[in-house]
Interface confidence: low
């Protein structure tokens, strides 16, 4: 998260850290007791590595009573996700067991009504991704409030040049932005999950390159089918 600040500890009980061989790889969001939603591209380079999900965390390194690392029983990338596109960049991870819920671990309601979030709406994005252009990784969860950007502006030639389909949404990126390591994390508007941070190699913090988020409402049928 660029230009954000440390989050209030455990105030986002839905927040997950998707980990590869014990290190933070991507963000994720608990959407059901046994399921975490993230970004498909996160696992592209995982190969034979061990993928786990950390729930109930604020600090990645410090002991916290609510923290627990779960093994992954099943990883389900969206069937249409491909390495070279940002489209359909969703991944569902089934935990080895139902998460132990409590004040610091709780699923987040996700948007099912397939309607664009109004431009200008402030949404919260959080993650353990890099906090500056030098690549410094934070130990504690960071967050930032970002205004949603209309699709027409986001699709300008100077911005994302038509790449933003109706299944994607944008948020402004002027110095405050999601960045590397935040992929798969939640974009929350009005207490509801609206988007998932895409995991492309986009430049961060440049207002001409807005943040791109996968609209979960557009994938309601797929999410329901996997969780069923």
């Amino acid at each position: 998260i660029l230009g954000g600040r440390e989050a209030e500890a455990h105030a986002r009980p839905y927040m997950a850290s998707v980990q590869l061989n014990g290190a933070h790889l991507c963000g994720g969001v608990l959407v059901a007791e046994q399921w975490v939603l993230s970004a498909a591209h996160c696992l592209e380079d995982a190969a034979d590595g061990k993928v786990q999900v950390l729930l109930g965390a604020h600090s990645l390194s410090q002991p916290e009573p609510s923290k627990r690392l779960y093994d992954v029983l099943r990883a389900v990338p969206h069937p249409d996700s491909q390495p070279d596109t940002i489209d359909h960049d969703l991944l569902l991870l089934q935990l080895s067991e139902k998460a132990t819920l409590g004040p610091a671990v709780r699923p987040l309601p996700w948007q099912r009504v397939d309607r664009d979030v109004a431009p200008g709406t402030l949404c919260d994005v959080a993650g353990w991704g890099i906090v500056n252009h030098a690549g410094r990784r934070p130990d504690s969860l960071q967050h930032v409030l970002l205004p949603v950007l209309d699709r027409a502006t986001c699709n300008r030639r100077t911005h994302h040049d038509g790449a933003i389909t109706e299944r994607l949404m944008c948020a402004e990126s002027n110095r405050r932005d999601s960045c590397k390591g935040d992929s798969g994390g939640p974009l929350v508007c009005g207490g509801v999950l609206e988007g998932v941070v895409t995991s492309g190699s986009r430049v961060c913090g440049n207002r001409k390159k807005p943040g791109i988020y996968t609209r979960v409402a557009s994938y309601a049928a797929w999410i329901d089918s996997v969780l069923a």
Epitope: G3, R5, A7, E8, A11, G120, T121, L122, D124, L145, L146, P147, E172, S173, N174, R175, R176, G190, G191, R207
Partner: antibody
Framework: EVQLQQSGPELVKPGASVKISCKAS????????MNWVKQSPEKSLEWIGD????????TYNQKFKAKATLTVDKSSSTAYMQLKSLTSEDSAVYYC???????????????WGQGTLVTVSA | DIVMTQSHKFMSTSVGDRVSITCKAS??????VDWYQQKPGQSPKLLIY???TRHTGVPDRFTGSGSGTDYTLTISSVQAEDLALYYC?????????FGGGTKLEIK
């Protein structure tokens, strides 16, 4: 039109507490941090802390952590600051202030309340 | 905490003059600096944010500049109504901190 309307002046005795309010209108109250700032002749402007009205999460200036408590009432779009164990050093004007967003992310404290004068005197 | 130092507590100028008010941060604040104007009996008013972006409705005689630790608010042609206190503030890291203020006096 964005407005932050603060409660009126307070004359309080040393050791007492006071709770001042800031009613917001003209914008989405839960979308923007509410900040509180102290202004005294000796110390100019000092940031006390802020609250995210959406979650109730607070960030305090360590200097004021034992002095101020920030809360919000989302139903009335009102932010509150309680100051406790008051001394003469707490006599000051207290402002609520909020940043805003104009199409290209954060701008500074664009909107300020009119200020609440707190006088601590026996 | 980051300390914002405005070395001149008072500056005296004449109508029509160009004046520059300076602010020095105790560490690099990466242009995360705002400038405020406060007239007697009023609340502070935002003039400049992100070091150089003029806030809506602010006359173009007010200009902000700077980077790293050094920032400047320039009034290209001072008007009588510019008599006020001017504060810089950093929003680089909490606690947000303000400079001590510079009082602009008209000769």
């Amino acid at each position: 039109e964005v407005q932050l309307q603060q409660s009126g002046p307070e004359l309080v005795k040393p050791g007492a507490s006071v709770k001042i309010s800031c009613k917001a209108s003209g914008y989405s109250f839960t979308g923007y941090y509410m900040n509180w700032v102290k202004q005294s002749p000796e110390k100019s402007l000092e940031w006390i802390g802020d609250i995210n009205p959406s979650t109730g999460g607070t960030t305090y200036n360590q200097k004021f952590k034992a002095k101020a408590t920030l809360t919000v009432d989302k139903s009335s779009s009102t932010a509150y600051m309680q100051l406790k164990s008051l001394t003469s050093e707490d006599s000051a004007v207290y402002y609520c202030a909020t940043p805003y967003y104009y199409g290209s992310s954060y701008v500074g404290f664009a909107y300020w309340g009119q200020g609440t004068l707190v006088t601590v005197s026996a | 905490d980051i300390v914002m130092t405005q070395s001149h507590k008072f500056m005296s100028t004449s109508v029509g003059d160009r004046v520059s008010i300076t602010c020095k941060a105790s560490q690099d604040v990466s242009t995360a600096v705002d400038w405020y104007q406060q007239k007697p009996g009023q609340s502070p008013k935002l003039l400049i944010y992100w070091a150089s972006t003029r806030h809506t409705g602010v006359p173009d005689r007010f200009t902000g500049s700077g980077s790293g630790t050094d920032y400047t608010l320039t009034i290209s042609s001072v008007q009588a109504e510019d008599l006020a206190l001017y504060y810089c503030q950093q929003h680089y890291s909490t606690p947000w901190t303000f400079g001590g203020g510079t009082k602009l006096e008209i000769k």
